[in-house]
């Protein structure tokens, strides 16, 4: 719609605005054309008007007091459906010795500007000029409902008109309708629903899956009590007035179950002793996820079957399983609760740790001199095979010989097989300090415990042997 | 109510291209897998292809190069891309979605566990 | 590529029967159970009957059973039924492969 805008009050012939076949009219029931409305004055016919009234101080030069200005009556209610049109307006006589006098439209406290429909149209006399300014609105909403007034400013006098009720009736307006909810399967709760009119009463009545819940309406706003579902159901209202019905959205109420389980589960790497996972969840029951469960067992058949248990927030649907054994199968499931429960396990998957580098060094290292053939040997015993953390490939043996201000140190790869090596007598009259690890593809395990064993002059007898004891042994 | 539904076939002209769509309603494409199957006319079922709730795709090797699996989960609808079509071709193409689904992301794999629901299907008659 | 061998390829049974479905696999399915078995019938999409080799599908009559690990399954209908005249598939993943096969199909005709 057009907003009202003020217009510039002129004596005299106004191009575009002056209508000579046009009888001034003081009020405007209604237009032709649009639905006649009902009307309703505030004041008696004939009576005179006394509120609003503006007493310029201006005089003539014959120095003659003017009359008061005041808005002439013009109908006071009118009461008309949505969608219909209205015109209306306010009429006053002004004395033609006023210039630049301006009138607006007001609604509800506030100046109407913009696009509104207002015309103001100017009918000059000899002394004064009648003004009419009129208000119409094409098709009505509820959004038009309100007082409107003319507003007049004449030597910084305002004159006020009364104020005109428009009333837009209608079919209910609801304010508050239902909201789907999740709840728990036979628990109350509650559901509101709240509709106004013009014209009121406005009465509900509640609909369960597209039947009604009561048979009675209830005056707006009303609120049903639901004792409990067990199983999803559509509620809506309806909402009735002289004007009609109205019908709510219709609300689906979900009854709150345990979850699906995860759609999907991926591997996203794997080192000797974690698997990272991630999953995407299911359904989540209509109740919010609250955590995970990860439930990890050795694939092995051989395996006694125990399974771990990590538990995990819901968010971020990633998990690292830690303190896994490497070069190692796994069947792994993931589980999510909410506050019903716990879903099923996902399908189990299959996933297996990478070859790690041996977690423990070799035991019981003894280390001896062979004089007679200038040798050192070496002996040890392997890591326990779980500790090994994959297949071993091999040794590495770290010697390092000291003697008076010079140290040298030597590392040597032994095979798989067996379990001594033999290392040639680098310096006489020296320490040599040995120190093995066990190696797999995955990498070089720790070294153990360094063994010493004095290497002396050439001519002196010790074939003593050195070692470190297996764990265990003090 | 949970329900897919395959549109797109037609006659089409050996070595011509087609697009298969598959409008899912009822679940979200962003929260499962899915899955094109065909089965040419008194034949058996013969697995395509897959997309995987983040947009990995694998294929059967027989389609890879003709054949693209893609979605749009905004509009929760799956995408058949069929390139280079031949007589053999002419099947009907049923879009599936995946029950569960294992992805090994480190080796570029992944394994279909079950096809839980199924679209009625789209004819794709090849022939010129 | 694996493959699934169906077995028979067509049988003939009445109501009432008990009717015997095979799967062999060329090689063990994943986790040895992630087989599953469809039913179709004319001018309809497949239906899931069975997953985890012996799960029974959500609305999935309890006639229907399956059973077996690794390559060998087996899918049973205890009691024959008219509305179970159809053709069955098995269907299975592999480790280390994308590929879902499906079995030749075995029609169940009326005798």
């Known amino acids: 719609r057009e907003e009202a805008k003020p217009y510039p009050l002129f004596p005299g012939p106004f191009p575009g605005s002056l209508q000579t076949d046009h009888t001034p009219l003081l009020s405007l029931p209604h237009a032709s054309g649009y639905q006649p409305a009902l009307m309703f004055s505030p004041t008696q016919p004939g009576r005179p008007h006394t509120g609003n009234v503006a007493i310029p101080q201006v005089t003539s030069v014959e120095s003659k007091p003017l009359p008061p200005l005041a808005f002439k009556h013009t109908v006071g209610h009118i009461i008309l459906s949505e969608h219909k049109g209205v015109k209306f307006n306010c009429s006053i006589s002004v004395p033609n010795i006023y210039q630049d006098t301006t009138i607006s439209w007001w609604k509800d406290g506030k100046e109407l500007l913009g696009a509104h429909h207002a015309i103001t149209q100017f009918y000059p006399d000899d002394e004064v000029t009648a003004i009419i300014a009129s208000f119409s609105i094409t098709s009505v909403q509820r959004s038009d409902n309100g007082s409107y007034i003319c507003k007049m400013k004449i030597n910084n006098e305002e004159i006020v008109s009364d104020p005109i009720y428009i009333e837009v009736q209608g079919l209910p307006h609801f304010t508050k309708q239902p909201e789907s909810m999740n709840v728990t399967r036979n628990t109350a709760f509650n559901l509101t629903c709240q509709a106004v009119g013009p014209p009121e009463p406005v009465n509900i009545f509640w609909v369960q899956n597209s039947s009604r819940v009561n048979e009675q309406p209830e005056k707006s706003p009303s609120v049903l009590t639901v004792p409990g579902l067990t199983e999803m159901a559509v509620f809506s209202c309806e909402a009735h007035n002289d004007k009609g019905l109205t019908v709510s959205k219709g609300v689906q109420i979900n009854i709150k179950a345990i979850p699906s389980p995860p759609t999907e589960v991926s591997i996203r790497n794997s080192t000797a002793h974690s698997i990272l996972i991630s999953w995407v969840p299911g359904f989540d029951g209509y109740s919010p996820f609250r955590n995970c469960s990860i439930q990890v067992k050795e694939a092995d058949p051989l395996s006694n079957g125990s399974v771990m248990i990590f538990n995990t927030s819901a968010l971020p649907h990633l998990y690292q399983i830690k303190q896994l054994q490497a070069l190692a199968n796994y069947s792994i499931g993931v589980s999510c609760m909410n506050e019903i429960g716990w879903s099923a396990v996902s399908p189990w998957i299959l996933a297996s740790t990478t070859e790690g580098a041996p977690s423990v060094a070799p035991l019981n290292v003894t280390v001896f001199l062979n004089e007679s053939s200038d040798n050192v040997d070496i002996r040890w015993m392997k890591p326990p095979t779980k500790q090994q953390d994959g297949e071993l490939v091999g040794y590495r043996i770290s010697h390092v010989w000291q003697s008076a201000g010079i140290s040298k140190e030597l590392l040597e790869e032994v095979g798989q097989n067996g379990s001594r090596a033999r290392i040639s007598v680098q310096v006489h009259n020296a320490t040599c300090t040995v120190r093995i690890a066990a190696v797999t593809r995955g990498g070089v395990g720790p070294f153990s415990d360094p063994v010493k064993i004095f290497i002396p002059a050439h001519g002196w007898v010790d074939y003593a042997p050195s070692s470190t004891p297996a764990p265990g042994n003090a | 109510e949970q329900q897919l539904v395959e549109s797109g076939g037609g006659l089409i002209q050996p070595g011509g291209s087609l697009r298969l769509s598959c409008a899912v309603s009822?679940?979200?494409?962003?929260?499962?897998?899915m899955s094109w199957v065909r089965q040419a006319p008194g034949k058996g079922l013969e697995w395509i292809g897959i997309?995987?709730?983040?947009?990995?795709?694998y294929s059967a090797s027989w389609a890879k190069g003709r054949f693209t699996i893609s979605k749009d989960s905004s509009k929760n609808t799956l995408y058949l891309q069929m390139n280079s079509l031949r007589a053999e071709d002419t099947a009907v193409y049923f879009c599936a979605r995946v029950g569960f689904f294992v992805g090994y992301g480190a080796y570029d794999y992944g394994i279909i566990h079950r096809l839980d629901l199924w679209g009625q299907g789209t004819l794709v008659t090849v022939s010129s | 590529d694996a493959q699934l061998t169906q077995s028979p390829s067509t049988l003939s049974a009445s109501v009432g029967d008990r009717v015997t479905i095979t799967c062999q696999s060329s090689?063990?399915?994943?986790?040895?159970?992630?087989l599953s078995w469809y039913q179709q019938k004319p001018g309809k999409p497949p239906k899931l009957l069975i997953y985890?080799?012996?799960d029974l599908a959500s609305g999935v009559p309890s006639r229907f059973s399956g059973s077996g690990s690794g390559t060998e399954f087996t899918l049973t209908i205890s009691s024959l039924q008219p509305d179970d005249f159809a053709t069955y598939y098995c269907?299975?993943?592999?480790?280390?492969?994308?590929?879902?096969?499906f079995g030749g199909g075995t029609k169940v005709e009326i005798k």
């Open positions: 997309i995987s709730s983040s947009g990995s795709t």
């Open positions: 269907a299975g993943g592999y480790s280390g492969d994308s590929d879902y096969a």
């Open positions: 985890d080799a012996s």
């Open positions: 090689k063990s399915i994943y986790n040895n159970n992630w």
């Open positions: 009822g679940f979200s494409l962003s929260s499962n897998a």
